[in-house]
Interface confidence: low
């Protein structure tokens, strides 16, 4: 003689967070008469998920109409699944009794695993800017994913990076997990337009990884090179001296002209020209009245770039010499910020 069996045909069910989990349970017989209850876990500490007979279970709906006498399908749907719902669910048949119903038979259980998508990766760079040739660290964080298996990759301008360390927490079992990775990136002068990308791949993303980006323009400081040049005479007794400020980033830059150590003029770079690599160029000029000087004049172009210590370049103007164009000096390198062309 056949006895009622409680069949939970799905050994495991995998559901994405936010979706609905369907837990199948079928009784092979209509007798004995009595309700079905669903529990998460087994033993005395099990949690009641659904009781056919009584109670309010707002997240649970039944697949079929349990009010029908001939119903054998006791499958349920649990809505808006979160990682906290993971566990093994048991469908339990009770036999009608007095005063209480008596547990008759349990299904083998269905393990509900919740797939939760990782949050969008957030990439953070260093607090302070750094100059080319220096190594800076970027961090990438993503949270709330399940299962634990996840892949994280770093790229700079499409090229995969290898110098990084990644941790997934917690180490043990959890309803959801977080990932934290730190990558080291060596800056170059051409990195103003560069991007660092953190890419996270997870089973929930169906082959379409999430990406977080950081622009190196927020991280890099390219110091300017200076060149002071004496231009041809503009008029009798006047010499035009220019200071070329080249290849700097960011734009924040202040330039001061000194004549024999005395401040002649200070200006802030505003109208600048941009190079293809994202750095800026700026030129400032100073018109020197030679007749006002008896002795030779030391002209100094002093640049303060992005709050860094000033760098300078000097040019000696010989007042006794015939005002012909003099050669340019070698550029001095320094850190820089803003710039403008002033004519």
């Amino acid at each position: 003689e056949e006895e009622l069996q409680v069949i939970q045909p799905d050994k495991s069910v995998l559901v994405a967070a936010g979706e609905t989990a369907t837990l199948r349970c079928t009784a092979t017989s209509l007798i004995p008469v009595g309700p079905i209850q669903w529990f998460r876990g087994a033993g005395p500490g099990r949690e009641l998920i659904y009781n056919q007979k009584e109670g309010h279970f707002p997240r649970v709906t039944t697949v079929s109409d349990l009010t029908k006498r001939n119903n054998m399908d006791f499958s349920i749907r649990i809505g808006n699944i979160t990682p906290a719902d993971a566990g093994t669910y048991y469908c339990v048949k009770f036999r009608k009794g007095s005063p209480d119903d008596v547990e008759f038979k349990s299904g083998a259980g269905t393990e509900l695993s919740v797939r939760a998508k990782p949050s969008a990766p957030v990439v953070s760079g260093p607090a302070a800017r750094a100059t080319p040739q220096h190594t800076v660290s970027f961090t990438c964080e993503s949270h709330g994913f399940s299962p634990r298996d996840i892949t994280l990759k770093w790229f700079k301008n499409g090229n995969e990076l290898s110098d990084f360390q990644t941790n997934v927490d917690p180490v043990g079992e959890s309803v959801s997990y977080s990932i934290h990775s730190t990558a080291k990136v060596v800056l170059t002068r051409e990195d103003v337009h560069s991007q660092v990308i953190c890419e996270v791949a997870h089973v929930t993303l169906q082959g379409d990884p999430l990406r977080g980006t950081a622009n190196l323009s927020e991280t890099i400081r390219v110091p300017p090179t200076l060149e002071v040049t004496q231009q041809p005479v503009r008029a009798e007794n006047q010499v035009n001296v220019t200071c070329q400020v080249r290849k700097f980033y960011p734009q924040r830059l202040q330039l001061t002209w000194l004549e024999n150590g005395n401040v002649s003029r200070t200006e802030t770079a505003s109208t600048v020209t941009e190079n293809k690599d994202g750095t800026y160029n700026w030129m400032s000029w100073l018109l020197v009245n030679v007749s006002a000087h008896r002795d030779d004049v030391k002209l100094t172009c002093q640049v303060e770039h992005d709050g860094q210590p000033a760098v300078s370049k000097s040019h000696d103007l010989k007042v006794s010499a015939h005002p012909k164009e003099q050669g340019s000096n070698t550029a001095a390198e320094n850190t820089g910020s803003n710039e403008r062309n002033i004519y």
């Epitope: 069996q5 069949i7 045909p9 799905d10 495991s12 069910v13 995998l14 199948r24 083998a108």
Partner: antibody, heavy 122, light 107 residues
Framework: QVQLVESGGGVVQPGRSLRLSCAAS????????MHWVRQAPGKGLEWVAV????????IYADSVKGRFTISRDNSKNTLYLQMNSLRAEDTAVYYC???????????????WGQGTMVTVSS | DIQMTQSPSSLSASVGDRVTITCQAS??????LNWYQQKPGKAPKLLIY???NLETGVPSRFSGSGSGTDFTFTISSLQPEDIATYYC?????????FGGGTKVEIK
């Protein structure tokens, strides 16, 4: 490659017995419920029986209940259908089938064998 | 058992035609309905699951819709390789039951 291969079909006289086998490969056999579905010549499809992943639960169509027994040997990745007291109306191609876990319920048959023909005739 | 009534039992259409097959369940089966294609001498092949979801690798000209008791299977543009018999199948209740099939031929 996921594969189900049936064997054991043939011609048998009414009242006699026959045992069908279904060899599974390419997937974790022990994690899936397994089914037998049949198709009489020129007719439609009829579900016959299901067995739970661990063999503890078995359900049969009314038309075969008491005559057919479904079983499995997970160590051999093999499903069986023992057919006793065969009748002429049992003549059909017998397919074993299973489902992919992506289906919430266990009765969407996305993996089928090629079928084995059972002819019950005197 | 849930009775699945499929219609028509056969149809003939031209290449490129839109073909529609209906399946009616004897009671509400939610959206737990599959559609299969079976070519002569071959095992059935799952095309649509859960009433409207296209099985991986199945051409997008096949589609399904419906919920409750009434379901529709559509081939948007019939191709010569679509000559086959198509079956609906419910799996809300045991036993799972199939429709009688629709044989699709080319004019």
């Amino acid at each position: 490659q996921v594969q189900l291969v049936e064997s054991g079909g043939g011609v048998v006289q009414p009242g006699r017995s026959l045992r069908l086998s279904c060899a599974a490969s390419g997937f974790t056999f022990s994690s899936y419920g397994m089914h037998w579905v049949r198709q009489a010549p020129g007719k439609g499809l009829e579900w016959v029986a299901v067995i739970a992943y661990d063999g503890s639960n078995k359900i049969y169509a009314d038309s075969v209940k008491g005559r057919f027994t479904i079983s499995r040997d997970n160590s051999k990745n093999t499903l069986y259908l023992q057919m006793n007291s065969l009748r002429a109306e049992d003549t059909a191609v017998y397919y074993c089938a299973t489902t992919d876990t992506k289906y919430t319920l266990g009765f969407a048959f996305d993996i089928w064998g090629q079928g084995t023909m059972v002819t019950v005739s005197s | 058992d849930i009775q699945m009534t499929q219609s028509p039992s056969s149809l003939s259409a031209s290449v490129g035609d839109r073909v529609t097959i209906t399946c009616q369940a004897s009671q509400d089966i939610s959206n737990y309905l599959n559609w299969y294609q079976q070519k002569p001498g071959k095992a059935p092949k799952l095309l649509i699951y859960d009433a409207s979801n296209l099985e991986t690798g199945v051409p997008s000209r096949f589609s399904g819709s419906g919920s409750g008791t009434d379901f529709t299977f559509t081939i948007s543009s019939l191709q010569p390789e679509d000559i086959a018999t198509y079956y609906c199948q419910q799996f809300t209740y045991l036993p799972p039951t199939f429709g009688g099939g629709t044989k699709v031929e080319i004019k």
